[in-house]
């Protein structure tokens, strides 16, 4: 059957933890991505931002996991209105910001 939202979110959090704590060199060679609003629809927005990073094996699993949270297909170059299109940040900071937001959602019991 389908994976419960809380389990899927836990797995995503644990993957993001792995990424943030296992950095031995700049994540994705210091690639920059669009910052996003961490609000409703953030999973699709996060995927839209990260999918533009190619050739970075460290975040491939995260990209796959985010696609499971996003109801529509996302492809490179696609952007929604959820992006703060004037701000680019390093992938490492993007991942840490996303991780913190997801941890807070989990603390509040908001799994969906």
């Amino acid at each position: 059957g389908p994976v419960p939202p809380s389990t899927a979110l836990r797995e995503l959090i644990e993957e993001l933890v792995n990424i943030t704590q296992n950095q031995k060199a700049p994540l994705c060679n210091g690639s920059m991505v669009w910052s996003i609003n961490l609000t409703a629809g953030m999973y699709c927005a996060a995927l839209e931002s990260l999918i533009n990073v190619s050739g970075c094996s460290a975040i491939e699993k995260t990209q796959r996991m985010l696609s499971g949270f996003c109801p529509h297909k996302v492809s490179a170059g696609q952007f929604s209105s959820l992006h703060v299109r004037d701000t680019k940040i390093e992938v490492a900071q993007f991942v840490k910001d996303l991780l913190l937001h997801l941890k807070k959602l989990f603390r509040e019991g908001r799994f969906n």
Partner: antibody
Framework: QVELVESGGGLVQPGGSLRLSCAAS????????INWVRQAPGKGLEWVSG????????LYADSVKGRFTISRDNSKNTLYLQMNSLRAEDTAVYYC???????????????WGQGTLVTVSS | SYELTQPPSVSVAPGQTARISCSGD??????VSWYQQKPGQAPVLVIY???DRPSGIPERFSGSNSGNTATLTISGTQAEDEADYYC??????????FGGGTKLTVLG
């Protein structure tokens, strides 16, 4: 308000055993990771052990692994630490400390009890 | 195992800014908490998730964390801020880990 009250400390001989308890109130006990942290006299903080909200995960510092056992009874809102084969270096104030959330990645303490002193000496 | 390093002591004049550092390998990849401990008392959380303040903690306390160093900043330090301060974080290998502590002295 969040309250954590430790008990069970005292004087014990090397090689002896002691069981600490921590009574929790003021929050939903079964939704949080809980830790034991100790502080030797005049020294810094040392994390000892922690347990997930549902007891599904228990973790220990290398210094106590195999000698200490953490457990919890969510029906009684109580945390325990069974300490066996005690050594002089285990002498410390033992604090019960709630984690920020339910899981290991949120185990960093937010609220602390006042502590209970364990003295291991002959 | 993961280690956090703090200066043993920091001194500051009343009303000035105190900065306490906490260094560790890629500490910026973790979330740092800061605890205040006064003699004979239990630690009190003053900063968590790098720069969030629990309710009841004065705005003069703030935190930052990037690279290999996290910093606790106390702006307009008051006499009542004199205490030991510990940084702490969670690491996948060591689990909860604390720095050795920094004694903050408010001069005068």
């Amino acid at each position: 308000q969040v309250e954590l009250v430790e008990s069970g400390g005292g004087l014990v001989q090397p090689g002896g055993s002691l069981r600490l308890s921590c009574a929790a109130s003021g929050f939903t006990f079964n939704s949080y990771w809980i830790n034991w942290v100790r502080q030797a006299p005049g020294k810094g903080l040392e994390w000892v052990s922690g347990i997930a909200y549902d007891s599904s995960n228990t973790l220990y510092a290398d210094s106590v692994k195999g000698r200490f056992t953490i457990s919890r009874d969510n029906s009684k809102n109580t945390l325990y630490l069974q300490m066996n084969s005690l050594r002089a270096e285990d002498t410390a104030v033992y604090y019960c400390a709630r984690g920020l959330g339910a899981f290991h990645w949120d185990m960093q303490p937010d609220y602390w009890g006042q502590g209970t002193l364990v003295t291991v000496s002959s | 195992s993961y280690e956090l390093t703090q200066p043993p002591s920091v001194s500051v004049a009343p009303g000035q800014t105190a900065r306490i550092s906490c260094s560790g390998d890629n500490i910026g990849g973790t979330f740092v908490s800061w605890y205040q401990q006064k003699p004979g008392q239990a630690p009190v959380l003053v900063i968590y998730d790098d720069n969030d303040r629990p309710s009841g903690i004065p705005e003069r306390f703030s935190g930052s964390n990037s690279g290999n160093t996290a910093t606790l900043t106390i702006s307009g330090t008051q006499a009542e801020d004199e205490a030991d301060y510990y940084c702490g974080t969670w690491d996948m290998v060591t689990n909860n880990v604390f720095g050795g502590g920094t004694k903050l002295t408010v001069l005068g």
